[in-house]
């Protein structure tokens, strides 16, 4: 007996060939021996089976001795043994229809779990193997679970269902709702305008929700809400904003915040949360602000940084075109009685400059 695997909602063609390449009598029946379709004269006739409105045959191939049965919009309950009767012989085809669906919405928040459920005919014992867009392989039986979705799980999952050495492939599009980056750091000189951007890692036709940016300044004892906003069909509207600092927010996506100037008292880290309509949970993105200040006071040239910096970052003071430098893995460096000239304050990570500020030291006569 031939085994054919089908996918729920798809179309399948069950083939049946006569030895003689000519139009002849044929019938397709189900396992109850009830006629599904057949030929009467030159016409296709349909029996009263449940497939009456979904079964068809390629009339153009009849005179080639090919009497296939096409079943549209497959259902799990179409799984059955079908019998083709032609030229006094019977050909049996076992059709097994499978369905693979995500238990919840296919738009899930980062960190949420994804469960894929296999619908299968009674008596079948299929195995399922799924491959994520990032190449992660997961195996299972009736259900497949991915406990914590990551950003890279967004995209098309390819799942292969195997039964009786036959396979059928399902493609399921999963959208992980997250910001493009989990965390970002902005490095600015004191007084510069600061731009914070929070691009989303997905696109939705209608995007509605609300958000807030909480800020923990390095110098402050507690965090405070800097801004709250609404998102309606990708349009952003500010609900509430603090007086100090007075943030500005872009009206369109990606979410964009502007801090008029970087000041040491603002240096710190923030957490932008976005709650989407009809979704439980929130999207998060951490944002850090590092502010640099270079000052000369009397005979002391000082460079300082505020905000969340890694201990491995190097802060240096360097006189332009001269070898004289002072470097430290610290948040402040200084030079006493600096030489006249253009000094550079550099914040760097393994030789890569993250932030620089120039200060001119004038000679003292």
């Amino acid at each position: 007996k031939k085994v054919v695997l089908g996918k729920k909602g798809d179309t399948v063609e069950l083939t049946c060939n006569a030895s003689q390449k000519k139009n002849t009598q044929f019938h397709w029946k189900n396992s109850n021996q009830i006629k599904i379709l057949g030929i009467q004269g030159l016409f296709l006739t349909k029996g009263p089976s449940k497939l009456s409105d979904r079964a068809d045959s390629r009339k153009s191939l009849w005179d080639q001795g090919c009497f296939s049965m096409i079943i549209k919009n497959l259902k799990i309950e179409d799984s059955d043994t079908y019998i083709c009767e032609v030229e006094n012989k019977k050909e049996e085809v076992e059709l097994l229809v499978f369905g693979l669906t995500a238990n919840s919405d296919t738009h899930l928040l980062e960190g949420q779990s994804l469960t894929l459920t296999l619908e299968s005919p009674p008596g079948s014992s299929p195995s399922v193997k799924c491959r994520s867009p990032g190449g992660k392989n997961i195996q299972g039986g009736r259900t497949i679970s991915v406990p914590q979705l990551e950003r890279q799980d967004s995209g098309t999952w390819t799942c292969t269902v195997s039964q009786d050495q036959k396979t059928v492939e399902f493609k399921i599009d999963i959208v992980v709702l997250a910001f493009q980056k989990a965390s970002s750091t902005v490095y600015k000189k004191e007084g510069e305008q600061v731009e914070f951007s929070f691009p989303l890692a997905f696109t939705l036709e209608k995007l509605t929700g609300s958000g807030e940016l909480w800020w923990q300044a390095e110098r402050a004892s507690s965090s405070k809400s800097w801004i709250t906003f609404d998102l309606k069909n990708k349009e952003v509207s500010v609900k509430r904003v603090t007086q100090d600092p007075k943030l500005q927010m872009g009206k369109k996506l990606p979410l964009h915040l502007t801090l008029p100037q970087a000041l040491p008292q603002y240096a710190g880290s923030g957490n932008l949360t976005l709650a989407l309509e009809a979704k439980t949970g929130k999207l998060h993105q951490e944002v850090n602000l590092v502010v640099m200040r270079a000052t000369q006071f009397q005979e002391n040239l000082t460079c300082e940084v505020w905000g969340p910096t890694s201990p491995k970052l190097t802060l240096s003071l360097k006189l332009e075109n001269k070898g004289a430098t002072v470097s430290k893995q610290a948040k402040a460096v200084w030079v006493l009685n600096p030489e006249a000239g253009m000094w550079q304050c550099l914040l760097s990570d393994s030789g890569q400059v993250l932030l620089e500020s120039n200060i001119k030291v004038v000679p003292t006569w």
């Epitope: 109850n32 009467q40 009263p48």
Partner: antibody, heavy 120, light 107 residues
Framework: QVQLQESGPGLVKPSETLSLTCTVS????????WSWIRQPAGKGLEWIGR???????NYNPSLKSRVTMSVDTSKNQFSLKLSSVTAADTAVYYC??????????????WGQGTTVTVSS | DIQMTQSPSSLSASVGDRVTITCQAS??????LNWYQQKPGKAPKLLIF???TLETGVPSRFSGSGSGTYFTFTIRSLQPEDIATYYC?????????FGGGTKVEIK
């Protein structure tokens, strides 16, 4: 056991639409075809068509242009609408269950029938 | 559509008589044939399916035979409660069609 009961107006004016409902009791409406058959007085039986619980239908070609069937699984009911009626549509209308099992296909449960007269 | 021709349209027989009704299909319908009994003022009742198989609870005096286009229905020994109209019905192809019926009366 499963019982069927037809309901609807006994008198319909010519050119109007005949509407009948069949209520299934004592069993589930799911996973069966449910059919309508009519019988003019002193005449034979005519299969009007059928509806599956998913909503898919098959109609008799002779009536197809005028027939609409629907199903309401939550109420365990299915319905028949026959538009543009004439006196020729006067008949006893039966609802029935079509049952398929091995080597078997038949209308095994019937309603008692309801008489519909088309007259002005 | 498949036409079903039943004959005779009516018959009168005595209690205990053997009664035979024939049904002819316009096309080969294999054994896809049912026989129904309809008593006056009642809904039809399925007696025989698959041309020759008796529905559960149907008395064994009823029988059916035939295949292809020609079928017969027999009441071996007519009883007073058998007064009814008998219909054949094909289920080979949609639309499902019935024969014109045979009215059986007691002499």
């Amino acid at each position: 056991q499963v019982q069927l009961q037809e309901s609807g107006p006994g008198l319909v004016k010519p050119s109007e639409t005949l509407s009948l409902t069949c209520t299934v009791s004592g069993g589930s409406i799911s996973s069966f075809y449910w059919s309508w058959i009519r019988q003019p007085a002193g005449k034979g039986l005519e299969w009007i068509g059928r509806i599956y619980t998913s909503g898919s239908t098959n109609y008799n070609p002779s009536l197809k242009s005028r027939v609409t069937m629907s199903v309401d699984t939550s109420k365990n009911q299915f319905s028949l609408k026959l538009s543009s009626v004439t006196a020729a549509d006067t008949a006893v209308y039966y609802c029935a269950r079509e049952l398929e099992k091995r080597n078997y296909y038949g209308m095994d449960v019937w309603g008692q029938g309801t008489t519909v007269t088309v007259s002005s | 559509d498949i036409q079903m021709t039943q004959s005779p349209s009516s018959l009168s027989a005595s209690v205990g008589d053997r009664v035979t009704i024939t049904c002819q299909a316009s096309h080969d319908i294999s054994n896809y044939l049912n026989w129904y009994q309809q008593k006056p003022g009642k809904a039809p009742k399925l007696l025989i399916f698959d041309a020759s198989t008796l529905e559960t609870g149907v008395p064994s005096r009823f029988s059916g035979s035939g295949s292809g286009t020609y079928f017969t229905f027999t009441i071996r020994s007519l009883q007073p409660e058998d007064i009814a109209t008998y219909y054949c019905q094909q289920y080979d192809s949609l639309p499902l069609t019935f024969g014109g019926g045979t009215k059986v009366e007691i002499k």
